[in-house]
Interface confidence: medium
C-alpha cells in the first residue's frame, strides 16, 4: 500500500537532482581553479543534510551552514552584479563582462540554479512529486531558505560601488517582495558599499521614457538612502545593443545609437 | 562618490609636449567610456576624443588626430591624454568626463587641468 | 561633422519667468527611437553638469523646471520658472555620430 505523502502546491524535486548538483560541482571546480580544493561528495553530502529527514516547511538558514561553509568564495567585492526579474540578461552580462560575478557565477549559486527540491518529515527521501509553494504553503521551505541565505551573504560580501539590473518592462520595476528587494538591499554594508547603482534595462524598441523616474525607483533610492548609501540609476534602452557593445567595444557604433 | 580628478597642467613652450592624468573614483572605471574635452578661456566646450573601456578603440576629432594621444590604465583608474606640439591656441582647460554607454551623455566631469602654452 | 548651432548667444530672464534656448543640428542627430542630443549647464568657475540626455531625460538630481523638447534637427532647453542658481552658460551636444560637436553656448542672466 503506498504510504500517504503530503501534496503541495509546487512543482516537486527537480529529476535527477543529486547527480545533477554534483555533476555541476564537478564542472564549477574544473573551471575555477580557485575552487578545486573543494571536495564535490561533502558538498552533495552537506546540500542533502539541510533538508532531507526535515519537514520542508520548517527548514532554517542554520540547516545550509555546513554548506555554506564547503561553499566560501572569495569573488572580488566591487565586481558584484544584483538582478531582479531579469536574470537572463544578468547572466549574458557576466558572461560578456567576466571580471563581474553574479550569484548563480559562485559555486553555490551555480549549484542550485533553476533548481527545485525538498525532502519528508522522519524519512530520507527526496520528493519528486511536489514542494511547498512560497506562496501558497509556507516561506521556510528548502529552496526559499537556500536563496535567502545564499543572497544575504552575497549582499554582504559587497563592497564600494554595486551594481543591479532591474526589469524595466515590469509594473513594479523594483519589487520589496523580490529577493533583490527584501534580502540584498537590506544586507548591504554601509561601511563598504559606497554607491548602489540600478540599471533599469527597457524592453520596449522605442521606449524613450526614463524610468529612473519610476515610483519604485524612488522608492528604492530612499530605502538606500537611508541606509547610508548613495544611489544612481541609468537607463539602458537597448540591452541588445548595449550587450553587444560590452562584448565588442571597438565597435564605431557603440558611442551613438545605443 | 563618482570623482574625477585631473592634474599635470601647467605652462609649456609652442612645440612642447605635456602629458595630463584624470584619476577616478566611485565607480567602475573598467566598464566606462571615457573623453577629454577642452575650454579655450571665454570660449564654449570642444570635444577632443574618447577611449573604449579596453583601449581597443580611441577616437579623436579630426583637427587634434595626430596631435593628441589618448590612453588609459584600469588597474590604476587613470585617464590620460598625451599632447605633442602644442600651439598657443591649445591653451585651455582640459576636463575628462565619463561617458555613460546607453545614452551618448557626459554624465561626470572632473574639474579641469588647465595648460597654458607660452614662450 | 555636425554643427550645432545655438541661439541666442544671451539670454536675459525674470525670475520666475520662462527663458527658452535653441539648437539646431545641421543634420539630423535623431534615430527612429531617439534624438542624441544632452544639456549641459556651466555655472562660472566650475566644469559643465548634465542637464538633459537624450533630448528630454533629466538627469537625476536636476529640478523639474529643467525640460527638453525636440527631434530631428531642432531641440530646445526650457527653464520654468527661473531661478536666481540659474545664471550659468548652457551647451546642447550632439552623440549620434563621430566626432561629438557642442553648441557655442548660451548666456543666462537675470534681468
Known amino acids: 500500500v503506498p504510504r500517504w505523502r503530503q501534496q503541495w502546491s509546487g512543482p516537486g524535486t527537480t529529476k535527477r537532482f543529486p547527480e545533477t548538483v554534483l555533476a555541476r560541482c564537478v564542472k564549477y571546480t574544473e573551471i575555477h581553479p580557485e575552487m578545486r580544493h573543494v571536495d564535490c561528495q561533502s558538498v552533495w553530502d552537506a546540500f542533502k543534510g539541510a533538508f532531507i529527514s526535515k519537514h520542508p516547511c520548517n527548514i532554517t538558514e542554520e540547516d545550509y551552514q555546513p554548506l555554506m561553509k564547503l561553499g566560501t568564495q572569495t569573488v572580488p567585492c566591487n565586481k558584484i552584479l544584483l538582478w531582479s526579474r531579469i536574470k537572463d540578461l544578468a547572466h549574458q552580462f557576466t558572461q560578456v563582462q567576466r571580471d563581474m560575478f553574479t550569484l548563480e557565477d559562485t559555486l553555490l549559486g551555480y549549484l542550485a540554479d533553476d533548481l527545485t527540491w525538498c525532502g519528508e518529515f522522519n524519512t530520507s527521501k527526496i520528493n519528486y512529486q511536489s514542494c511547498p509553494d512560497w506562496r501558497k504553503d509556507c516561506s521556510n521551505n528548502p529552496v526559499s531558505v537556500f536563496w535567502k541565505t545564499v543572497s544575504r551573504r552575497f549582499a554582504e560580501a559587497a563592497c564600494d560601488v554595486v551594481h543591479v539590473m532591474l526589469n524595466g518592462s515590469r509594473s513594479k520595476i523594483f519589487d520589496k517582495n523580490s529577493t533583490f528587494g527584501s534580502v540584498e538591499v537590506h544586507n548591504l554594508q554601509p561601511e563598504k558599499v559606497q554607491t548602489l547603482e540600478a540599471w533599469v534595462i527597457h524592453g520596449g524598441r522605442e521606449d524613450s521614457r526614463d524610468l529612473c523616474q519610476d515610483p519604485t525607483i524612488k522608492e528604492l533610492e530612499s530605502i538606500i538612502s537611508k541606509r547610508n548609501i548613495q544611489f544612481s540609476c541609468k537607463n539602458i534602452y537597448r540591452p541588445d545593443k548595449f550587450l553587444q557593445c560590452v562584448k565588442n567595444p571597438e565597435d564605431s557604433s557603440c558611442t551613438s545609437e545605443i | 562618490q563618482v570623482q574625477l580628478l585631473e592634474s599635470g597642467g601647467g605652462l609649456v613652450q609652442p612645440g612642447g609636449s605635456l602629458k595630463l592624468s584624470c584619476v577616478a573614483s566611485?565607480?567602475?572605471?573598467?566598464?566606462?567610456?571615457m573623453n577629454w574635452v577642452r575650454q579655450a578661456p571665454g570660449k564654449g566646450l570642444e570635444w577632443i576624443g574618447k577611449i573604449n573601456p579596453d583601449s581597443s578603440t580611441i577616437n579623436y576629432t579630426p583637427s587634434l588626430k595626430d596631435k593628441f594621444f589618448i590612453s588609459r590604465d584600469n588597474a590604476k583608474n587613470t585617464l590620460y591624454l598625451q599632447m605633442t606640439k602644442v600651439r598657443s591656441e591649445d591653451t585651455a582647460l582640459y576636463y575628462c568626463?565619463?561617458?555613460?554607454?546607453?545614452?551618448?551623455?557626459?554624465?561626470?566631469w572632473g574639474q579641469g587641468t588647465t595648460l597654458t602654452v607660452s614662450s | 561633422e555636425i554643427v550645432m548651432t545655438q541661439s541666442p548667444a544671451s539670454l536675459s530672464a525674470s525670475l520666475g519667468q520662462r527663458a527658452t534656448i535653441s539648437c539646431r543640428a545641421s543634420?539630423?542627430?535623431?534615430?527612429?527611437?531617439?534624438?542624441?542630443v544632452h544639456w549641459y549647464q556651466q555655472k562660472s568657475g566650475q566644469p559643465p553638469k548634465l542637464l538633459i540626455y537624450?533630448?528630454?531625460n533629466l538627469e537625476s538630481g536636476v529640478p523639474a523646471r529643467f525640460s527638453g523638447s525636440g527631434s530631428g534637427t531642432d531641440f530646445t532647453l526650457t527653464i520654468h520658472p527661473v531661478e536666481s542658481e540659474d545664471v550659468a552658460t548652457y551647451y546642447c551636444h550632439h552623440s549620434r555620430e563621430l566626432p561629438f560637436t557642442f553648441g557655442s553656448g548660451t548666456k543666462l542672466e537675470i534681468k
Open positions: 537624450l533630448a528630454s
Open positions: 566611485g565607480f567602475d572605471f573598467s566598464l566606462y567610456w
Open positions: 568626463a565619463r561617458l555613460w554607454i546607453a545614452t551618448g551623455g557626459f554624465d561626470y
Open positions: 543634420s539630423s542627430v535623431s534615430s527612429s527611437a531617439f534624438s542624441y
